[in-house]
């Protein structure tokens, strides 16, 4: 066949769907690769063709659209499973073509099984809620397009294995789940099960997401440098190892980049000639506040090094702060034996 623009296997779109549930999968060509949509392509006389490669096979084969009850069908740029089976797992290709043009992309589809408590290998999206921060809601994700607006589905919410009903603080509101005051105890996996009728059959959509309760923006502060501070003096003799920790607390801030860095005499350590190493460690609280520690280390410090200015800097979306470490050369203690001997006129 003639040349076809092949976008290869799009592993960025690792699609996972539950066994025995409907799935609608849009051809990724129009969403991520081409600059026109399906309607434009269709009206220009282009045809969308689907085929697949079964798991652990190399042979591409056409998709069987003549299964009983139209179990697999295509509608515009969407491939429908009503419902999926475990052996639908494989790599799927959609190809857009006419006599002069061809473009195609493949993507992996994995049909996964879940247990009665909704545990599965499915990768779960994470929804962050601010602690004690007004009423917040999560919405049952990825259910658009499965049924028309005239159909009124039933939605049941679960936390872990338990149906959410009559929880004081968490209230199912149809497609939404309301958290009146989010607390650490609300951390966990939440599942919505959407049940709807179609052509005399009943289908279920299961969607699970992880809720993580994080620090509230109303409690957020600029970075706080705990170390270095005014109470600790780094007093060293030449030849000793100099270790200065820079420990900074960052309030949780959604999408904030937290940064910590040292300057030595106003320059980044990379820009000066002394042999300095910096090691960083990061820890998080239960609400994802962050503590970063950067330890500045000079193995054998010189008297010149002990005269330099060592400043720890920190920055977040809330602001920037800096603190200088108090570094000084240790005054050597008098060597009494020699000095006393000299005092008595000994030679």
């Amino acid at each position: 066949s003639e040349r076809c623009d092949d976008w290869g296997l799009d592993t960025m779109r690792q699609i996972q769907v539950f066994e025995d549930e409907p799935a609608r999968i849009k051809c990724p060509l129009f969403e991520h690769f081409l600059k026109f949509n399906y309607s434009t392509a269709h009206s220009a006389g282009l045809t969308l063709i689907w085929y697949w490669t079964r798991q652990d096979r190399d042979l591409e084969e056409p998709i069987n659209f003549r299964l009983p009850e139209n179990r697999i069908s295509k509608e515009k740029d969407v491939l429908w499973f009503r419902p999926t089976l475990l052996n639908d797992t494989g790599n799927y290709t959609c190809m857009l073509r006419n006599t002069t043009y061809c473009s195609k992309v493949a993507f992996p589809l994995e049909v996964v099984q879940k247990d009665s408590c909704f545990n599965s290998p499915m990768k779960l999206p994470v929804h962050k809620l601010y602690i004690e921060y007004g009423i917040q809601r999560i919405t049952c994700p990825n259910v658009d397009g499965y049924f028309p607006s005239s159909v009124k589905p039933t939605i049941t919410w679960y936390m872990g294995c338990y149906k959410i009903q009559n929880f004081n603080n968490v209230i199912p509101e149809g497609m939404n789940l309301s958290f009146l005051i989010a607390l650490i105890s609300n951390n966990g996996n939440y599942t919505c099960v959407v049940t709807y009728p179609e052509n005399g059959r009943t289908f279920h959509l299961t969607r699970t997401l992880t809720v993580k309760v994080v620090g509230s923006p109303k409690n957020a502060v600029p970075p706080v440098i705990h170390s270095p501070n005014d109470h600790v003096v780094y007093e060293k003799e030449p030849g000793e190892e100099l270790l200065i920790p820079c420990t900074v607390y960052f309030s949780f801030l959604m999408d904030s980049r937290n940064e910590v860095w040292w300057t030595i005499d106003g320059k980044k350590p990379d820009d000066i000639t002394i042999d300095v190493t910096i090691n960083e460690s990061i820890s998080h609280s239960r609400t994802e506040d962050e503590t970063r520690t950067q330890i500045l280390s000079i193995k054998k410090v010189t008297s010149e090094d002990l005269k330099r200015s060592y400043v720890c800097h920190a920055r977040s979306a809330k602001g920037e702060v800096a603190k200088a470490a108090k570094v000084k050369q240790k005054v050597p203690a008098p060597r009494y034996t020699v000095e006393l001997a000299c005092g008595f006129g000994a030679t």
Partner: antibody, heavy 116, light 107 residues
Framework: QIQLVQSGPELKKPGETVKISCKAS????????MHWVKQSPGEGLKWMGW????????TYADDFKGRFGFSLETSASSAYLQINDLKNEDMATYFC?????????WGQGTTLTVSS | DIVLTQSPATLSVTPGDSVSLSCRAS??????LHWYQQKSHESPRLLIK???QSISGIPSRFSGSGSGTDFTLSINSVETEDFGVYFC?????????FGGGTKLEIK
Amino acid sequence: QIQLVQSGPELKKPGETVKISCKASGYTFTNYGMHWVKQSPGEGLKWMGWINTYTGEPTYADDFKGRFGFSLETSASSAYLQINDLKNEDMATYFCARYYGNFDYWGQGTTLTVSS
Amino acid sequence: DIVLTQSPATLSVTPGDSVSLSCRASQSISNNLHWYQQKSHESPRLLIKYASQSISGIPSRFSGSGSGTDFTLSINSVETEDFGVYFCQQSHNWPHTFGGGTKLEIK
């Protein structure tokens, strides 16, 4: 059937303290938040706050912080509203209301008269 | 705080008339709006939840519509027992707020 029964009308002097009770029956008390709503004579409804009947944690609207307190006696399926240092503007009818996304059941109201 | 404005303040109708009561929110509250009826010397009673969902035991002549900032409570063919004050209430965020009420009275 589900019922919220409040204590009877109260006549108090300014500076005194009043404690209004709300006894729930017909459902599991600790499964639903209990909210308090104030209705001054000839006026609308004002939300005062709520108490989480499972944890006992109270939340107060800004206008009701300080002199107002919500408490529970879980074993008696009862919620309480206490108002300290009563003022003339506290004269109103106070309702308890069960909450589950909205106020689906209300107490009959307790009328508080504050007069010297 | 979210402010709910109800209009009209008073509505005089004859039994058998159909009426619409309005509630406008100062910001979008999705469908997190509920309607209550309060008769003289009684506690409020939930009529409609989440803007348009009916409540069991409430006559079908009561219906609700709207989303975002504009909401309507409709009473199809008012009956004498319907006279009283109607309040809207939002549960979109703290603090919960009520509208000032619409008094439905006999003409």
